[in-house]
Interface confidence: low
């Protein structure tokens, strides 16, 4: 029931750190595997409209009490459930409040109108760098640089789950100028807003900007990868960076296309298609196994763009850690 789940610390009741009630006690939810499908169910349960983001729970003040329990380590919803309680859940001991899940819903009761339905960074290398675009009524719009600040960039990066905003002088690629309507100018963010839509701005659609003034934002992409244990940077056991922690990748479904994407992303030429024996010479990793069942088409520029199971979900041991050997 709605009384068994709530969002805490947000600007309105439809955003914040996720808390659930068990046996009369409120506790947090760990963000292992937490994604937009889980948020969609939560928003539905709370009567908060559609999901709009999966921000980190630590963004919301006041933070969880140190003694407050993490009651659920991972939630796995298909997105069709009516309540979070209907989703697969695991309660385990090994989750800290640094990993509390957060949620942001559209909030149909909100005073601002209309409510844009999303934000993205377009035409960049990955989803954490690019031209700022916002979605409204199934149409993407660009944002004018007039009045834009690093504070506004912080909000975008947070909303996209892309870490901190990076100060950049980069302008939009002239060959990739927005051909869309210009949505907003005079964005006035404090930097603490959960979404760009929460920032005060000039009147919607009324501005004198042109696409030369489209806003470009770069965030500190939290995803990175490396090859360790080899003779050079282009060979070794594959490790990916997630939530500031390096972890390995399971070899289930791993093949030539996945090799090629890794080599491409690292600027290491082409895969040398190593044998099973060669792959095993770098030994097993330790710590987290972050990814499993990675599926690439081979066209991706980053492993992050390939399909995979939720972060941290796997049925592997470190004996199955992927290793990659590129031409260098």
């Amino acid at each position: 029931s709605p009384s068994g789940v709530r969002l805490v610390g947000g600007l309105h009741r439809c955003e914040g750190r996720v808390e659930v009630e068990q046996k009369g006690q409120w506790g947090t939810v760990c963000d292992d595997g937490w994604d937009i499908k889980d948020v969609a169910v939560l928003c539905r349960e709370l009567g908060c409209g559609a999901a709009s983001g999966t921000p980190s729970g630590i963004l919301y003040e006041p933070p969880a009490e140190k003694e407050q329990k993490v009651l659920i380590q991972s939630v796995s919803c298909t997105g069709t459930e009516d309540t979070l309680a209907q989703c697969e859940q695991e309660e385990v001991y090994d989750c800290s409040h640094d990993e509390d899940a957060g949620a942001s819903c559209e909030n149909p009761e909100s005073s601002f109108s209309p409510v844009p339905e999303g934000v993205r960074l377009a035409d960049g290398p990955g989803h954490c760098k690019g031209r700022v675009e916002v979605k409204h009524q199934n149409q993407w719009y660009t944002v004018c640089q007039t009045g834009w600040s690093l504070r506004a960039a912080k909000v975008v990066c947070r909303q996209l789950g892309c870490g901190r905003a990076v100060l950049t002088q980069k302008r939009c690629n002239k060959h990739a100028y927005g051909r869309k309507p210009i949505w907003l100018s005079q964005m006035s963010c404090s930097g603490r807003e959960a979404t760009l839509q929460d920032c005060p701005s000039g009147p919607w659609g009324k501005n004198t900007c042109n696409h030369d003034e489209d806003t470009w934002v770069e965030c500190e992409d939290p995803f990175d990868l490396r090859l360790v244990g080899g003779d050079n940077l282009c060979s070794g056991r594959l490790e990916v960076l997630h939530k500031g922690v390096w972890g390995s990748v399971c070899d289930d479904n791993w093949g030539e296309k996945e090799d090629q994407v890794v080599c491409k992303q690292l600027g290491c030429g082409k895969s040398l298609s190593p044998s099973f024996r060669d792959r095993k010479c770098y030994g097993p990793g330790v710590g987290r196994i972050w990814l499993d069942n990675v599926r690439c088409s081979g066209e991706e520029q980053s492993l992050e763009q390939c399909q995979h199971r939720f972060w941290g979900f796997h049925d592997c041991t470190h004996q199955e850690d992927v290793a990659v050997i590129c031409s260098g």
């Epitope: 695991e90 309660e91 001991y93 090994d94 800290s96 941290g312 592997c316």
Partner: antibody, heavy 113, light 112 residues
Framework: QSVKESGGRLVTPGTPLTLTCTVS????????MTWVRQAPGKGLEYIGV?????NTYYATWATGRFTISKTSTTVDLKITSPTTEDTATYFC??????????WGQGTLVTISS | ELDLTQTPASVSAAVGGTVTINCQAS??????LTWYQQKPGQPPKLLIY???TLASGVPPRFKGSGSGTEFTLTISDLECDDAATYYC??????????????FGGGTEVEIK
Amino acid sequence: QSVKESGGRLVTPGTPLTLTCTVSGFYLSTHGMTWVRQAPGKGLEYIGVIVTSGNTYYATWATGRFTISKTSTTVDLKITSPTTEDTATYFCARPGYKSVPLWGQGTLVTISS
Amino acid sequence: ELDLTQTPASVSAAVGGTVTINCQASEDIYSGLTWYQQKPGQPPKLLIYRASTLASGVPPRFKGSGSGTEFTLTISDLECDDAATYYCQNNYGSSSNNYVFAFGGGTEVEIK
């Protein structure tokens, strides 16, 4: 709720040895399990943990020397290449950040030629 | 890697007296500290968990306190049976400490 270790015996140096911890009354899907050892006359020494996901984490000194694995009701500790310094009583224990810590009685491993 | 520094290494006190043992963590472990008592030839006996919660059957003469990085075990009204070695252990797991459930070095308590 209980845990019980087994498999401790006398082996020669270099002979791999696997110890087993059998749990009852709780689930390894909701609890991690650790291995700890104590050499004769020495203090308690933490080896490593297997968490619910099956991920394993080892003390720095133990990495490469031990392997922890599990089934639905047992947790194994493999001593990959024992030396005489690995002679000790080995305990398995459920950590207790949210729940009450739970220990077994221990199993004695002797490494001698 | 997370370290627990336990002091003193040994202490001697009279029956009826009080002993205080300290345990310092190298990083924040919140309330995730456990205290054990061990006598020769026996497995460790749980005294205190979650820093201050008394385990079942343990007399209230044993008191745990602290949180974060500083913890204390106080044994008052000492009895002869309290002669043993006492250990603290971290029971807070996180990726930042690589799930290292480390022990302190132990404190040997002698009763005069």
